[in-house]
Amino acid sequence: REPTVQCGSETGPSPEWMLQHDLIPGDLRDLRVEPVTTSVATGDYSILMNVSWVLRADASIRLLKATKICVTGKSNFQSYSCVRCNYTEAFQTQTRPSGGKWTFSYIGFPVELNTVYFIGAHNIPNANMNEDGPSMSVNFTSPGCLDHIMKYKKKCVKAGSLWDPNITACKKNEETVEVNFTTTPLGNRYMALIQHSTIIGFSQVFEPHQKKQTRASVVIPVTGDSEGATVQLTPYFPTCGSDCIRHKGTVVLCPQTGVPFPLDNNKSKPGGWLP
């Protein structure tokens, strides 16, 4: 029978660490991490890490009992967890019978949004207490709410990942810019900033009809030339406060009729908060 892995949590040092070993298995040949999505009962989905590793093809894998994988996550707070993946059989060949290196994977470490992860792996038995053992590590940065997969997560949807404000902005005259955008039921308070290297104007927008999606309009006084300036619209939603996803547009000249026309270069950009 071919070896497979059985993985379970192991937070402390492996028991083998306390034992003296004449020889230890060789190091891993490769370690990779990629995100995978899994459905959860709430109708949402979670993102998990698919950690895969390749064993070196030589006789040292005959000593191999397990591979331990530890993940440290750094975002607003630090997390640390480890799993130990035991091999179910002793290795009878250095490569798979069908050809290629022995490759295994573990899917289970949860992925939070916009977090840097450090993934380390080493074979067991590992090095003796005062020795450096072979190990491999990789970094993995999880995407934020603007990612094509992440944006459908409930947390991201509540932060406005699917909201398209369709911003239009035009220069009415030397002193004012008219900004129009589509509101969202996610919140009723917005901040519109006009920037041309520096902030040349801003306005708070309060939209009382929060439950309806309407088109809001605000005229903003400016203190400099506004043509070509950037409009930044910052929403304030309950889930993300002042760190919600921000949207951008560009100020153009108003048509003679005074009606601003839509732009096709609307851009979204994360604020400080990429949940």
Partner: antibody, heavy 118, light 107 residues
């Protein structure tokens, strides 16, 4: 029946290169590493290196790192070893040898004599 | 690299004799050892692997023993076709090395 058939003897001048082939049959080529071993006249055996036909990973004996280049053509189940900058002390019989479950050499080619002489 | 010391380098024996060849490694190779027989002008032939397992078609008069750093090839009753050179090889991990060889000659 597993067979490894090597190309014929070669006579080369110093500084030249030679490419030795090892045509295999009777097993799944990509499932086993292929090793190359050298035996100088009247001498013992020296391991040159090995290649995994599955993904062309190569591991060399440091001594031969700048001397030998190992390749495979999986479409015709053939391994190759090219020796460059030949010198008279490269005169030897060169063997291809297929690994077993681990790197014992279960099957050997008949050997290719490479003679380097001016 | 792991060093392989094979002894003796040559020996003379008669048909029917019991012959023992030893191989010492510079470090523990956990029985990852093979023995080969080579006749003049021919490729080596696998006799034993994993120190004790017989290769395909190898007569049972050949046997292997040992562990750690000391290994032995024994021919229980030497036959005329056994006059050849014998090599040990470790396959613990690259680079693989061979012993210097033992030439078994007719006394």
């Amino acid at each position: 029946e597993v067979q490894l058939v090597q190309s014929g003897a070669e006579v080369k001048k110093p500084g030249a290169s030679v490419k030795v082939s090892c045509k295999t049959s009777g097993y799944t080529f990509i499932s086993y590493w292929m090793n190359w071993v050298r035996q100088a006249p009247g001498q013992g055996l020296e391991w040159i290196g090995r290649i995994d036909p599955y993904d062309s990973e190569i591991q060399y004996n440091q001594k031969f790192k700048d001397k030998a280049i190992l390749t495979v053509d999986t479409s015709i189940s053939t391994a190759y070893m090219e020796l460059s900058r030949l010198r008279s002390d490269d005169t030897a019989v060169y063997y291809c040898a297929r690994s077993g479950g681990f790197d014992w050499f279960a099957y050997w080619g008949q050997g290719t004599l490479v003679t380097v002489s001016s | 690299d792991i060093q392989m010391t094979q002894s003796p380098s040559s020996l003379s024996a008669s048909v029917g004799d019991r012959v023992t060849i030893t191989c010492r490694t510079s470090e523990n190779i956990y029985s990852n050892l093979a023995w080969y027989q080579q006749k003049p002008g021919k490729a080596p032939k696998l006799l034993l692997y994993d120190a004790t397992n017989l290769g395909d078609g190898v007569p049972s008069r050949f046997s292997g023993s040992g562990s750690g750093t000391d290994y032995t090839l024994t021919i229980s009753s030497l036959q005329p076709e056994d006059f050849a050179t014998y090599y040990c090889q470790h396959f613990w991990g690259p680079p693989y090395t061979f012993g210097g060889g033992t030439k078994v000659e007719i006394k």
